[in-house]
């Protein structure tokens, strides 16, 4: 593969990875965040960092409660330098192909490129071509909000079902749930899973003369969204008079597999395609989100677009000392491999971002979930963090408790945004949120010591039991509001977090080549599955799990 | 900057062949739909031939069985072959890219001159 891009094999050959690496023997691991606040007054002032979004609205991250100093940030940023992370970063905006496995470029920064400047992929400035998919989208999603867009029958649309999986369903899904406050004309259903119950689950609460499906499938050939597709399609056939012209009314394709797509019965105007440099779980900015614009509107969706883009620009543009997604991937390699911490806890305090870890999981665990570096060397240091989170305060009522008394190490970020989208009560119901914001965060570093549990009137065994070490490292994002623009921010930022990470750890974030082996194997299950004889073909776990199966079935 | 430049026109007998190529650059060229139009002094712009993005195809009643429409999506190019020409064939031939997936997004090529003649 082509390895342009870096000059070295390992990270741990650069000289500031032994730099930290004796630097957190010698005081990372003993070093008190709480002693920390105590030698610096101006703490806070210093690590915390404010993003201007485009619309002037700001989101705060505060890093002052996290594990380090002023000689381990710049030693993490020598390491930075090091790696070279703004070579490879401005390697991507020019559309060089960084994804060298596939020899692609990597651009999903063009499709939110709203201030439309050229962008070039092997010659060709792809910046009109982002913007007229775009003026397709919303087109259509005008016309299907304001009724124009009539269904066979002559009623307007009421629902749409995104049928996609991995990037073609968790953008768009964990989007529409964030953005729910700006609803209101559509409502829309996600089928992504293989598990018959999901399609039949949904076509019960839809009507097949007000529905509009949309096949979310770059080549049109994922066997899971096909199989769907098409029950979607018999389904709706059995309902319609089996008369195939109706399709064209009730049926959208997100695709550029126009054979496939007219095959289906689908008429090609209504296709929206995306190019090979956007890599699906990167593809909520494309055509892919078309179930995002007909929900909240064209023009929230391109608030969104703009809001990712200003975080673009930051992350291009800032110093590395002042720069918010690099130093946020730089904290991450600081735990995952000088403390050696093997997960990444992300808890919104906000209900509607409770899709929001989930989204985040793939774009972290699929990005860097891998053990080759671009030298096609295996790492001898860890990569990919375990990403997992819920919303609080649901989240301190069960796995909050690992992360303050276990034995593990979870650097953790929580998010909240200052005004509610429903703000009840008097804003009684806002203010309890962020009172257990702040105290967790500020729980976890301060903890509780055995002389503070005695002088709470503790004694004897009980005392370690509720003795808390503290010194737990979180990150506090405090956005004004979950707007469309914030939440493009928001997403962007945890690109540009795991870009870095992958960057110091010189593996490619942007293949996936560890989804195949199991869906090889799985069509060889398939055919076994279609017959009655007895399966012997596998290991004996297998053979046996299968036939039970069989026998079951 | 965008470019599909036309070429392979020419004068040709009645009952000859031509064949016209269309070489583009600067467009991701996979995701256009491409076509052949021409012109004829005097006449307005008419539609030839087209080529999806798949490599469906869409030809004129009167060159329907005579002209063959083709893409080459590695050489970023198309291509009109055009068999038993007629004196009614003269005419501008120009080339034109439709981003298949958009709005809005047209571009032409300069024309080539096609002259059958005896």
């Known amino acids: 593969s082509n390895n342009s891009f870096t000059n070295f094999k390992l990270a741990t050959e650069l000289p500031a990875w032994s730099k930290l690496q004796k630097i957190y023997e010698s005081q990372g691991k003993t070093l008190s965040v709480k002693q920390e606040f105590q030698k610096d007054a101006k703490r806070f002032e210093k690590l915390n960092k404010t993003f201007t979004n485009y619309d002037g609205s700001k989101i705060l991250f505060d890093y002052s409660k996290n594990l380090v100093n002023d000689e381990i940030i710049a030693a993490l940023i020598e390491l930075a330098k090091e790696a070279n992370v703004t070579g490879l970063r401005d390697a991507m905006f020019k559309g060089e192909h960084i994804n060298s496995t596939e020899d692609r470029a990597v651009y999903h920064v063009a499709l939110r490129n709203r201030a439309n400047k050229p962008m070039y992929v092997d010659g060709v400035n792809v910046a009109p071509e982002v913007d007229s998919v775009l003026k397709h989208m919303k087109e259509f999603s005008e016309q299907v909000r304001s009724g124009e867009w009539k269904g066979y029958t002559g009623k307007k649309i009421t629902d749409v079902v995104n049928i996609g999986i991995g990037g073609s369903d968790l953008g768009p899904v964990m989007v529409t749930e964030a953005l729910k406050h700006y609803a209101g004309v559509l409502d829309v259903h996600f089928v992504s899973n293989i598990d018959g119950t999901h399609i039949a689950e949904t076509l019960k609460v839809v009507d097949p003369e007000t529905t509009l499906f949309l096949i979310a499938s770059k080549t049109f050939t994922t066997a899971e969204t096909i199989t769907n597709a098409n029950t979607a399609k018999n389904w709706f056939l059995s309902k319609t008079g089996n008369d195939p012209s109706h399709i064209a009314k009730h049926f959208a394709a997100l695709s550029t597999n126009e054979t496939e797509v007219a095959k289906f019965g689908i008429d090609t105007k209504n296709m929206f395609g995306f190019e090979s440099w956007v890599g699906g779980r990167y593809s909520v900015w494309s055509a892919i989100g078309l179930s995002v614009a007909l929900y909240i509107g064209y023009d929230n969706f391109e608030a969104f677009l703009k809001g990712a883009e200003a975080v673009d620009n930051h992350f291009t543009q800032t110093p590395l000392e002042d720069n918010i997604p690099l130093l946020g991937g730089l904290l991450s390699v600081w735990y995952n491999n000088f403390f050696g911490a093997q997960t990444h806890l992300v808890a919104p305090f906000d209900q509607y971002l409770h899709r929001f870890p989930a989204y985040l999981q793939q774009l972290s665990m699929e990005s860097n979930g891998k053990s080759v570096t671009r030298g096609n060397v295996f790492t001898d240091y860890s990569t990919g963090s375990i990403l997992f989170g819920e919303p609080a305060t649901n989240a301190q009522h069960s796995f909050f408790q690992l992360v303050h008394q276990g034995t593990k190490l979870i650097p953790s970020d929580f998010i909240l945004a200052a005004q509610s989208h429903n703000p009840i009560e008097n804003k009684l119901h806002q203010k309890m949120l962020a009172s257990n914001f702040f105290a967790q965060a500020e729980a976890l570093m301060v903890g509780k010591d055995e002389e503070q549990v005695k002088a709470e009137g503790a004694t004897g065994g009980l005392v370690p039991h509720k003795v808390f070490s503290g010194n737990r490292p979180t990150t506090s994002i405090l956005a004004q509001k979950i707007t469309p623009a914030t939440l493009g921010a928001l997403i962007a930022y945890y690109e540009h977090v795991t870009f870095t990470e992958g960057a110091i750890w010189n593996i490619n974030s942007f293949d996936q080549w560890g989804v195949e082996l199991g869906k090889v194997l799985a069509k060889v299950i398939g055919k076994e599955l279609d017959n009655s004889s007895t399966i012997s073909t596998h290991d004996a776990s297998t053979n046996g799990l299968i036939n039970q199966f069989k026998e079951w079935m | 900057q965008v470019q599909l430049v036309e070429s392979g026109g020419g004068l040709v007998q009645p009952g000859g062949s031509l064949r016209l190529s269309c070489a583009a650059s600067?467009?991701?060229?996979?995701?256009?739909?491409m076509a052949w139009y021409r012109q004829a002094p005097g006449k307005q712009r008419d539609m030839v031939a087209d080529?999806?993005?798949?490599?469906?195809?869409n030809y004129a009643d009167s060159v329907k069985g005579r002209f063959t429409i083709s893409r080459d999506n590695a050489k970023n190019t198309v291509y009109l072959q055009m068999n038993s020409l007629k004196s009614e064939d003269t005419a501008v031939y120009y080339c034109?890219?439709?981003?298949?997936?958009?709005?809005?997004?047209?571009?032409w090529g300069q024309g080539t001159q096609v002259t059958v003649s005896s």
């Open positions: 600067g467009i991701s060229f996979g995701s256009y739909t």
């Open positions: 034109k890219a439709d981003f298949a997936y958009g709005r809005d997004l047209t571009y």
């Open positions: 080529i999806t993005t798949g490599g469906r195809t």
